[in-house]
């Protein structure tokens, strides 16, 4: 059966300056390939976090993604600003040159509330 990407929350609300967690779990590690988070869809979507590299300011993984059995690819966004509003997608890729997108979560819309 094909891997499923589960984003349980359809939306979350967060006050500006606070942190929010965007949840994502996979049903399988296979097929092998990276997991990335994007805001938006299509050509203009913005890479928010990749589990293959470090150095994403304000965004961290929630669980220990270095566990070999890890299926939790949730992220935490800190010090949220109004510009962070939008719909976030957890996306599974299959290894290749280049990697191929094979499954996306349903998306979680982030609403940023004024403080």
């Amino acid at each position: 059966t094909e891997v499923k990407v589960i984003q349980p929350e359809k939306s979350v609300s967060v006050a500006a300056g606070d942190s929010t967690v965007l949840n994502c779990t996979l049903t399988s590690l296979l097929p092998v390939g990276p997991i990335r988070w994007y805001r938006g869809v299509g050509q203009s979507r913005q890479l928010i976090y990749s589990f293959t590299t470090e150095h994403f300011p304000r965004v961290t993984n929630v669980s220990d993604a270095t566990k070999r059995s890890n299926l939790d690819f949730s992220i935490r966004i800190s010090n949220v600003t109004p510009e962070d509003a939008g719909t976030y997608y957890c996306v599974k890729f299959q290894r290749g040159s280049p990697d191929t997108e094979i499954q996306s979560g349903g998306g979680t819309e982030v609403y940023v509330l004024a403080k």
Partner: antibody
Framework: DVQLVESGGAVVRPGETLRLSCTAS????????MSWVRQAPGKGLEWVSG????????YYADSVKGRSTISRDNSKNTLYLRMSSLTAEDTAVYYC???????????WGLGTLVTLSS | ALTQPASVSANPGETVKITCSGG?????YGWYQQKSPGSAPVTLI????KRPSDIPSRFSGSASGSTATLTITGVQAEDEAVYYC???????????FGAGTTLTVL
């Protein structure tokens, strides 16, 4: 620069116990899974054990399972491997290696030599 | 176990390809260079085709299905070494290595 420095290698007798250490610098140690890889004289590389970044999950090759314990102290940037019931087959250079996101290796230490001698 | 040729040889400037098979489609591959026994391995390639920034561009990697290939374009005398392929299998959580390929530069 990433640096991994192993220590603790020694000449030991069969049946004894040894603890190897690997001190890391130049990167955020607590963010990376780590592994031990060994190389017996005249032989190829053999993965021995791995540990997740938090230290909660550990993994072992069949050849050492049940008599080895991998651990880490993130406050000291140090990785450990405790090996008991040592045999001649454990004679090797032991390397610590930093894991990539998909559990391959990107940086290696210089190694520490473990020699079994009766 | 991963399978790679025991030895290859080439003249300076030639292109060398070393293959590694047996990991299956649930594996990622890496390539490691060891210039002398007991010396520290150096990672040339990880994640099938990712080259660390300090590795010369003449080293490249690729993978198709369950076979990985290390290509050295314009081999140099200093490339004489043993090359190990390594794999990580997502179904067993285990790392494996090939037996190593000795590259001789004629």
């Amino acid at each position: 620069d990433v640096q991994l420095v192993e220590s603790g290698g020694a000449v030991v007798r069969p049946g004894e116990t040894l603890r190897l250490s690997c001190t890391a610098s130049g990167f955020t140690f607590s963010s990376y899974a780590m592994s031990w890889v060994r190389q017996a004289p005249g032989k190829g590389l053999e993965w021995v054990s791995g540990i997740s970044a938090s230290g909660s999950d550990t993994y072992y090759a069949d050849s050492v399972k049940g008599r080895s314990t991998i651990s880490r102290d993130n406050s000291k940037n140090t990785l450990y491997l405790r090996m008991s019931s040592l045999t001649a087959e454990d004679t090797a250079v032991y390397y610590c290696a930093r894991e990539t996101w998909n559990h391959l290796f990107d940086y290696w230490g210089l190694g520490t030599l473990v020699t079994l001698s009766s | 176990a991963l399978t790679q040729p025991a030895s290859v040889s080439a003249n300076p400037g030639e292109t060398v390809k070393i293959t590694c098979s047996g990991g299956g489609t649930s594996s990622y591959y890496g390539w490691y260079q060891q210039k002398s026994p007991g010396s520290a391995p150096v990672t040339l390639i990880h994640s099938d085709d990712k080259r660390p920034s300090d590795i010369p561009s003449r080293f490249s990697g690729s993978a198709s299905g369950s076979t990985a290939t290390l290509t050295i374009t314009g081999v140099q005398a200093e490339d004489e070494a043993v090359y190990y392929c390594g794999g990580y299998d997502y179904t067993t959580y285990v790392n494996t290595f090939g037996a190593g390929t000795t590259l001789t530069v004629l």
